[in-house]
Interface confidence: medium
């Protein structure tokens, strides 16, 4: 793959969730999510999953859905090999695991949905001696996590069958697996689980069929069968109101995709923690996400994080459509593995792509809080180190949020051109118009275009062509100035905002490679979030907690939007979690003294729902990282609290997990917390990973943006998955995002393992 650079504008909040294109299981089988709801009323179990997004209906969060205890699966996901990003076990098809290897060493952290499921169990009962293999699908993790391990398998992640009753995406709107490639992430899951078919709500997208049987199921859970691949072509997204295709909007933002932000200074990952919280962050534009598919070449991502002070978050809202990135199928996955899935399963499992998913616009009247605006630029390099400048599907989003304001989210699906690998599926950009005024907090990674702050992300499809996701709603600099006028003190109440899941690149079916990162079928898709070994000289650094409430365009519920509370002045606040105390912000100079501290995440176990587990899919919309010095030590999100909400785009369904988030002594977020929320536009599954990246690059304060972090993930040998994205978790830690999705079997496995305490 060429070295598509993906630039992400990290913004704390985004107005809307971005729907990504369909996810597809790369494995031969696409999980059909059963849409039948579980008997229990309430939100479906899968927390942030929105049926529309991943094509599987997400069970509403059940009243009892809160995960009380992390399962092995949950633990497992965190266990993903934190070695070089490319080294994560799932990611490396042939990596050898020495005997006696610990879960972390094994690189078992990221797994496809099944894995996540499995992992959760393991995590919960570490003491039980239960291996976390919740089913084999659980990601490996500490003992008890073995379930998760299975989920990490290469097979395409199983797409959970969501309850059929879950909201269905309108036909054509639901993510459809246009290509098997999308399943790649899920392949890992598949590996763990094998070709699980998840039944899900009947897909209405092209080729989507209802999964036969099990309609009688009382299951509250999504019945979506993810096991079967979703082959139906992505549904067409409705054109923006202005009539422009989403791409055109992106194109408007002019920027050189490959260019790092000017003055970008590589900063240690930890620098975020030190960035003064004072820097207001504008709300990131909808993430323009694209993930390059590289079957073989590991992607190298350089993240340039720019902190733009005093920018209204609203600005970024406008552009939210994501560019699709096609991902290579897992080795050996290819059409063959999918073959079975492509069959009737595929039809059944076809998950509608969230084409029309729109983030609900936040009330315009709401004040916009200032949060430091981080612009992360990801430079992904294929193994060969080559980067093709060819742009295949360039999805562009308009720089102005206003233009998209009334638009329905566009998530046009288009298969990656030239990618014969069924596993490889371009993610479809979803444009979710949000009123510029609405202070939505959706974290997304947006590509930056030009100085406007919009960033374009180039994604290379498996075909080798780069796709550029235009920055979402990157507000023109002028807008930023406006934002300043309405700025709310950066300090925000401790109450967690909606999960920044939206900030994550869409994990929707579009990205077959993204499907569950752990899916064995697509090593590239498989997320590897090995913690990068920081230079010995650097000390672990905590990143300021950034939470961006993800908003599911389709469901207001998903968008748990805390009332805009004027943020307390962060200047006076010391964030314990982010240890923003260490951040010295010098106005004018933007000098940031970043203490190169490595976050010692090895000790951090993401607990149920923690954002720490959130995996960020490259190509995601701009992610707004809000440096909130929220003292989470005292805050425990209770069952039903936003902290426990998992937001999945597409379904807008929010699952509130009962687990209490205990941030007290640890920065480790729990599984149910927002920290784990990964927002995949397009309904990507959330994968909870505990892996945190520390930026090891030298951090230099960037005067203009406050600070720009350049993070290069080491090329992952044998791993083409562009999953390595760093997210700043609410805990302030930067998580490598593997784009695992709970909706996939691998994710389930991982979750199970994590829950078992692995």
């Amino acid at each position: 793959m060429a070295e598509p650079r993906q630039e992400f504008e990290v913004m704390e909040d985004h107005a809307g969730t971005y729907g990504l294109g369909d996810r597809k299981d790369q494995g031969g089988y696409t999980m059909h999510q059963d849409q039948e709801g579980d008997t229990d009323a309430g939100l479906k179990e899968s927390p942030l999953q929105t049926p529309t997004e991943d094509g599987s209906e997400e069970p509403g969060s059940e009243t009892s859905d809160a995960k009380s205890t992390p399962t092995a699966e949950d633990v497992t996901a965190p266990l993903v090999d934190e070695g070089a990003p490319g080294k994560q076990a799932a990611a490396q098809p042939h990596t050898e695991i020495p005997e006696g290897t610990t879960a972390e060493e094994a690189g078992i952290g990221d797994t496809p949905s099944l894995e996540d499921e499995a992992a959760g169990h393991v995590t919960q009962e570490p003491e039980s001696g239960k291996v976390v293999q919740e089913g084999f699908l659980r990601e490996p993790g500490p003992p008890g996590l073995s379930h998760q391990l299975m989920s990490g398998m290469p097979g395409a992640p199983l797409l959970p069958e969501g309850p059929r009753e879950a909201t269905r995406q309108p036909s054509g709107t639901g993510p459809e697996d246009t290509e098997g490639g999308r399943h790649a992430p899920e392949l890992l899951k598949h590996q763990l689980l094998g070709d699980l078919h998840q039944e899900g709500p009947p897909l209405k997208g092209a080729g989507g069929k209802e999964r036969p049987g099990s309609k009688e199921e009382v299951d509250e859970d999504r019945d979506v069968d993810e096991s079967s691949p979703q082959d139906s072509p992505p549904s067409k997204a409705s054109p923006a109101q202005d009539g422009r295709p989403p791409q055109t909007a992106a194109r408007e933002a002019t920027s050189i995709p490959g260019f790092p932000a000017e003055g970008a200074i590589p900063l240690p990952v930890d620098f975020l923690s030190k960035v003064s919280t004072e820097i207001p962050a504008s709300e990131p534009d909808g993430p323009s996400v694209g993930r390059a598919k590289g079957q073989d070449a590991p992607l190298e991502f350089t993240f340039h994080v720019e902190i733009t002070p005093n920018v209204q978050k609203e600005q970024a809202h406008s552009e939210e459509h994501l560019g699709r990135a096609a991902f290579p199928g897992a080795p050996g996955e290819g059409p063959e593995a999918r073959g079975p899935s492509l069959g009737e399963d595929t039809k059944e499992a076809d998950l509608p792509e969230p084409s029309e998913k729109q983030p609900a616009a936040a009330p315009r009247g709401k004040p916009v809080s200032r949060v430091p605006q981080l612009k992360a630029r990801m430079v992904s390099k294929s193994k060969d180190g080559t980067g093709s400048d060819d742009k295949k599907a360039k999805t562009s989003t308009r720089s102005s949020a206003k233009t998209l304001k009334n638009r329905p989210c566009l998530s046009p699906k288009h298969p990656t051109p030239g990618s014969s690998d069924p596993l490889i599926q371009p993610s479809s950009p979803a444009v979710c118009p949000e009123p510029p005024s609405s202070p939505k907090y959706v974290s997304s990674v947006t590509s930056r275009t030009g100085s406007s702050g919009a960033k374009e992300m180039k994604l290379k499809g498996a075909d080798g062509k780069t796709k550029i996701a235009t920055p979402r709603g990157a507000a023109p600099p002028g807008q930023k100035g406006q934002a300043n006028a309405t700025r709310i003190p950066a300090k925000t109440p401790p109450a967690p905002k909606t999960p920044p899941s939206s900030g994550e690149p869409p994990k929707s079916g579009d990205r077959s490679g993204y499907s569950s990162p752990g899916s064995p079928g697509t090593p590239g898709s498989r997320s590897r979030t090995p913690s990068l070994p920081t230079p010995p000289t650097r000390e672990p650094k905590k990143v300021a907690v950034v939470r961006t409430p993800p908003k599911s365009p389709s469901s207001a519920k998903s968008r748990l939007q805390t009332a805009p509370v004027p943020m307390p002045d962060l200047k006076n606040v010391k964030s314990k979690i982010g240890s923003t105390e260490n951040l010295k912000h010098q106005p004018g100079g933007g000098k940031v003294q970043i203490i190169n501290k490595k976050l010692d995440l090895s000790n951090v176990q993401s607990k149920c729902g923690s954002k720490d587990n959130i995996k960020h899919v490259p190509g995601g919309g701009s992610v707004q990282i809000v440096y909130k010095p929220v003292d989470l030590s005292k805050v425990t999100s209770k069952c039903g609290s936003l902290g426990n909400i998992h937001h999945k785009p597409g379904g807008g369904q929010v699952e509130v997990k009962s687990e209490k988030l205990d941030f007290k002594d640890r920065v480790q977020s729990k599984i149910g917390s927002l920290d784990n929320i990964t927002h995949v536009p397009g309904g990507g599954n959330k994968k909870i990973e505990t892996h945190k990246l520390t930026f090891r690059e030298n951090a230099k304060a960037k005067t203009d943006h406050g600070a720009e972090i350049v993070y290069k993930s080491p090329v992952v040998s044998g791993d083409t998955s562009p999953r390595h994205l760093s997210n700043v978790s609410s805990t302030g830690s930067i998580d490598m995002v593997d784009s695992p999705q709970l909706a996939t079997l691998a994710d389930e496995v991982s979750a199970s393992l994590a829950k078992q305490g692995l």
Epitope: S68, S128, R138, M150, G155
Partner: antibody
Framework: QVQLQESGPSLVKPSQTLSLTCTVS????????VAWVRQAPGKVPEWLGA???????YYNPALKSRLSITRDTSKSQVSLSLSSVTTEDTAVYYC??????????WGRGLLVTVSS | QAVLTQPSSVSGSLGQRVSITCSGS?????????VGWYQQVPGSAPKLLIY???IRASGVPDRFSGSRSGDTATLTITSLQAEDEADYYC?????????FGSGTRLTVL
């Protein structure tokens, strides 16, 4: 203590639907995944499917057309329904916590015989 | 469906070291560390030994270890004990479904 108990008929006639219920305790079917695995006498365990903690259902592609897994969180139960059974479906059916690779706790198993 | 191939039987003497392999493909075993190993004594439900390819489940003696090389996962039992005689299954997942290996009967001589 985490426990899973399979329940259902031990004898099912061919072409009928086999319905089994897994009642769990010590954990929540909402937060944990529950997988169904069966093992025919003298054979290798076969993963049937699972109810993910996310509420998603996963099915063995070979059985998906006949298999349905549902979850009743209020009862802490996960049910399996296998339609059009044949004698080849005779096996010990296990429900277990987890998905597969990390299934750490298994039920005792229920021998279901399909016979006319 | 994917197949995980294991030797049908393996034997070893007490105190010896034995290894059971599980060969899959790059789509499952080789794709990542998502292999689980189960021990099943006839008449009992499988017991999780290793998950995540190399992580021991709680309560599992350290005599058991897992590893992976390429597309093959290996369960190694050092200092073989009489109680180790059982059937061993590897498990993994792929394409949204999980599956078990063909199983290996370990005989302690």
């Amino acid at each position: 203590q985490v426990q899973l108990q399979e329940s259902g008929p031990s004898l099912v006639k061919p072409s009928q639907t086999l319905s089994l219920t897994c009642t769990v305790s010590g954990f929540s079917v909402i937060s944990d995944s529950v997988a169904w695995v069966r093992q025919a006498p003298g054979k290798v365990p076969e993963w049937l499917g699972a109810s993910g903690s996310s509420g998603n259902k996963y099915y063995n592609p070979a059985l998906k057309s006949r298999l349905s897994i549902t979850r009743d969180t209020s009862k802490s139960q996960v049910s399996l329904s296998l339609s059009s059974v044949t004698t080849e479906d005779t096996a010990v059916y296990y429900c277990a916590r987890g998905i597969i690779a990390g299934v750490d706790v298994w039920g005792r198993g229920l021998l279901v015989t399909v016979s006319s | 469906q994917a197949v995980l191939t294991q030797p049908s039987s393996v034997s070893g003497s007490l105190g010896q070291r034995v290894s059971i392999t599980c060969s899959g493909s790059s789509s499952n075993v080789g794709y990542g560390n998502y292999v689980g190993w189960y021990q099943q004594v006839p008449g009992s439900a499988p017991k999780l030994l290793i998950y995540g390819t190399a992580i021991r489940a709680s309560g599992v003696p350290d005599r058991f270890s897992g590893s992976r090389s390429g597309d093959t996962a290996t369960l190694t039992i050092t200092s073989l004990q009489a109680e180790d005689e059982a059937d061993y299954y590897c498990a993994s997942y792929q394409s949204n479904y999980a599956f078990f290996g063909s199983g290996t009967r370990l005989t302690v001589l």
